[in-house]
Interface confidence: low
């Protein structure tokens, strides 16, 4: 007997690392293997149209799963039976079951990270599951789906007792049949009074809505078409065994004539439109490395040619509650360093024939901005900066300090929270910028914190190119060039003139241009010129010069 279908459900979740063996396998969902790797592509079995009461349940045969060690998933049952009540409308939802409406538009949808990654699930004790799609591709995507959180116990099979009364021309004769639907979907009919036997339907009628699952064999590169019927049907030319048509070549049509003793001629002629080979498609991560912290790009690539009409191929992605009917999807504004799960499938003529799931972890994001605590100078040649590190992951810091147009940058260890700047220029404004960075798929720099300080004054350097020249017998002209480093706020030149050890003149000018008059004739003088920056005097430049004997 087939497993009891779960309530229709859709979950976005991180793949569990161990099989959830106690959970029921939903009808027509692909069993994925445990996510020891982040991607698995599967052969897919699919039911696409509503089933008649004769076919209320189907099961995925174990060999259709590519020998996967299957774990069970809570997914959307692809069995859609408008003729009969389903679990979705007959079963009271268990505690912790939400109902959510999904639509094909992702405009207002928010993609949440998979539970169990960096995001915190808001359902206590929730277990992560793989997800599947609403699988009837011809139904609108605005189906209301029940988001089923796992229960380790399978839901009990629902038994529906339906009394069918057949009225005949003999008014006093009533035929009452009780039809019990067993979990396998076969009908057990207990008859109390049989007055009339309804005529058999034609096989063309009975199997009008027959559905097919295509199972691919990667070794032989051939498909098997599994006919979704409960009874063992017969096929013309003995083309099928156990309701399976074997050895179908990709992209070729095959015709199967279906009959059964429960129906009459004409037989159902089923045209099998075989999809392309599964390995001709590859799900490719097309995310740009620069944007891999907040975006995910996934794209189906055709890696080999095939003869199927590409117009008949449709693609579908589901990431969280967003569904896209595109060959390529791009998700933006995601959280860095979070895992996101995307399921995708390819359909041929609305028959699903392959699927893949990817769990992608977004890259490390840019680190936050460090918070500067101290940033100042209390000395002429040193400064200090201390900071709080950013909250997000980072590898190291870059500290840059700029004076006028010169810029120096240092790479600092991630554990540092303080740096002493040495050999700075006195009385100079320094602008500092500090940012953290992380080397991920690319290097990402965080926002820079900025600060500035001005170093303290220091003694200026010596004046240079000092000259002393006689302008007359008792007059001298003293000139010099400004110091290379002023190291302070002001600009003043001083000249001291000594004769022997006696200071005879002390002058101060804005420019280094002194005219010294009325000196003693024939006397040796010492001329000392220095610069004063308002805080400190510089080293004097010293020259000796003598006045001449008066010419008059």
């Amino acid at each position: 007997q087939s497993p009891t279908p779960s309530p229709t459900g859709l979950t976005t979740a991180k793949m569990p690392s161990v099989p959830l063996s106690s959970d029921p396998l939903p009808t027509h969902t692909t069993a994925f293997s445990p996510a020891s790797t982040f991607e698995r592509e599967n052969d897919f079995s699919e039911t696409t149209t509503s089933l008649s009461p004769d076919n209320t349940s189907t099961q995925v045969s174990p060999d259709s799963l590519d020998n996967a060690s299957a774990f069970n998933t809570t997914g959307v049952s692809s069995v859609q039976t408008p003729h009969l009540p389903t679990h979705a409308d007959s079963q009271t939802p268990s505690a912790g079951t939400d109902t959510q409406t999904f639509s094909g538009s992702a405009a207002n949808a928010k993609l949440n990270p998979t539970p169990g990654s960096n995001a915190i699930s808001d359902v206590p004790g929730e277990r992560s599951t793989a997800s599947t799609f609403p699988t009837d591709p011809v139904s609108p995507l605005t189906t209301t789906l029940s988001l089923a959180h796992h229960s380790s116990a399978a839901l009990p099979a629902r038994t529906s007792n339906t009394t069918i009364t057949a009225n005949t021309s003999d008014a006093y004769l009533n035929a009452s049949e009780t039809t019990t639907l067993s979990p396998s979907g076969s009908a057990v009919i207990s008859t109390t009074t049989i007055a009339t036997t309804p005529s058999k339907p034609t096989c063309d009628e009975k199997y009008a809505n027959i559905t097919v699952d295509y199972l691919y064999n990667k070794e032989t590169k051939l498909f098997t078409a599994k006919l979704n019927v409960n009874e063992n049907v017969e096929c013309g030319n003995n083309t099928c065994t156990n309701n399976e048509v074997h050895n179908l070549t990709e992209c070729k049509n095959a015709s199967v004539s279906i009959s059964h003793n429960s129906c009459t001629a004409p037989d159902k002629t089923l045209i099998l439109d075989v999809p392309p080979g599964v390995e001709k498609f590859q799900l490719h991560d097309c995310t740009q490395v620069e944007k891999a912290d907040t975006t995910i790009c996934l794209k189906w690539k055709n890696i080999e040619t095939f003869t199927c009409d590409t117009q008949n191929i449709t693609y579908r992605f589901q990431c969280g509650n967003m569904i896209f009917d595109n060959k390529e999807i791009k998700l933006e504004n995601l959280e860095p360093e979070h895992e996101y799960k995307c399921d995708s499938e390819i359909l041929y003529n609305n028959h699903k024939f392959t699927n893949a799931s990817k769990i992608i972890k977004t890259d490390f994001g840019s680190p936050g901005e460090p918070q500067i605590i101290f940033c100042r100078s209390e000395a002429a040649h040193q400064g200090v900066i201390t900071w709080n590190p950013p909250q997000r992951s980072f590898h190291n810091f870059t500290l840059c300090y700029i004076k006028e147009t010169e810029k120096d940058c240092l790479n600092l260890d991630k554990n540092l929270i303080k740096y002493d700047l040495q050999n700075l220029k006195p009385y100079t404004k320094y602008v500092l910028s500090l940012h953290a960075y992380i080397i991920a798929k690319v290097q990402r720099n965080g926002s820079a914190a900025m600060c500035h300080f001005t170093t303290k004054s220091a003694p200026p350097s010596q004046v240079w190119n000092m000259t002393v020249s006689m302008t007359s017998d008792n007059s001298m002209h003293v000139k010099c060039r400004p110091p290379r480093d002023r190291n302070g706020p002001h600009e003043r030149y001083h000249l001291e003139v000594e004769a022997g050890n006696t200071l005879v003149r002390n002058e101060s000018h804005k420019n280094c241009d002194f005219r010294v008059k009325d000196l003693q004739y024939s006397t040796d003088y010492t001329f000392k010129a220095y610069f004063h920056n308002g805080d400190y005097p510089g080293e004097p430049f010293i020259l000796h010069h003598s006045t001449s004997y008066n010419s008059k």
Partner: antibody, heavy 122, light 112 residues
Framework: QEQLVESGGGLVQPEGSLTLTCTAS?????????MCWVRQAPGKGLEWIGC????????TYYASWAKGRFTISKTSSTTVTLQMTSLTAADTATYFC??????????????WGQGTLVTVSS | AQVLTQTPSPVSAVVGGTVSISCQAS????????LSWYQQKPGQPPKLLIY???KLASGVPSRFKGSGSGTQFTLTISGVQCDDAATYYC????????????FGGGTKVVVK
Amino acid sequence: QEQLVESGGGLVQPEGSLTLTCTASGFSFSGNYYMCWVRQAPGKGLEWIGCLYTGSSGSTYYASWAKGRFTISKTSSTTVTLQMTSLTAADTATYFCARDLGYEIDGYGGLWGQGTLVTVSS
Amino acid sequence: AQVLTQTPSPVSAVVGGTVSISCQASQSVYNNNNLSWYQQKPGQPPKLLIYDASKLASGVPSRFKGSGSGTQFTLTISGVQCDDAATYYCLGGYYSSGWYFAFGGGTKVVVK
């Protein structure tokens, strides 16, 4: 000469409020300082209350016991205040204002004020 | 909350001798070295002696030495002088979404 002077201490009733002021001289807070308050009950040890970063972010940090009752603010380029509410006898202490707690910057060890005594009593 | 436990008071020292005061943190201080030592004399504010666990503050005699890392720190005074009689406090800095400081309970040093 750089200095810190605390003011505003005195006698206050239980459940009352008080604001202490720390005034800097010889420097201003434009230099991005880390101004902290520390208290010392009579005959007891030092207890950290909280700190304010005087830079543009103006971040404040508090001891867990001080959150909610104590608020540190920069009121001018040379003053920082400590607002205290719901005072009890356990808050009786000398309150110190300190700069650069636990650090030395360019040869300047952390600067402390002389403290101001707060007595909570009815 | 972080707790810093110091050597119980009082600790006796003799002039010229050596005295060690320990400070144990309940959690590693930030960067394993964000610990400073203060000296306080009656009626005075504390004075910084050691910062970053082992760096000597300016103007502090070299007979004061700080050592340790993580959770265990020691202040050693060698060649003790009468002027060293005071209470010594350790101060730990922690960072977790913001700064947090904690003082040790203090250790009184009596010089004989």
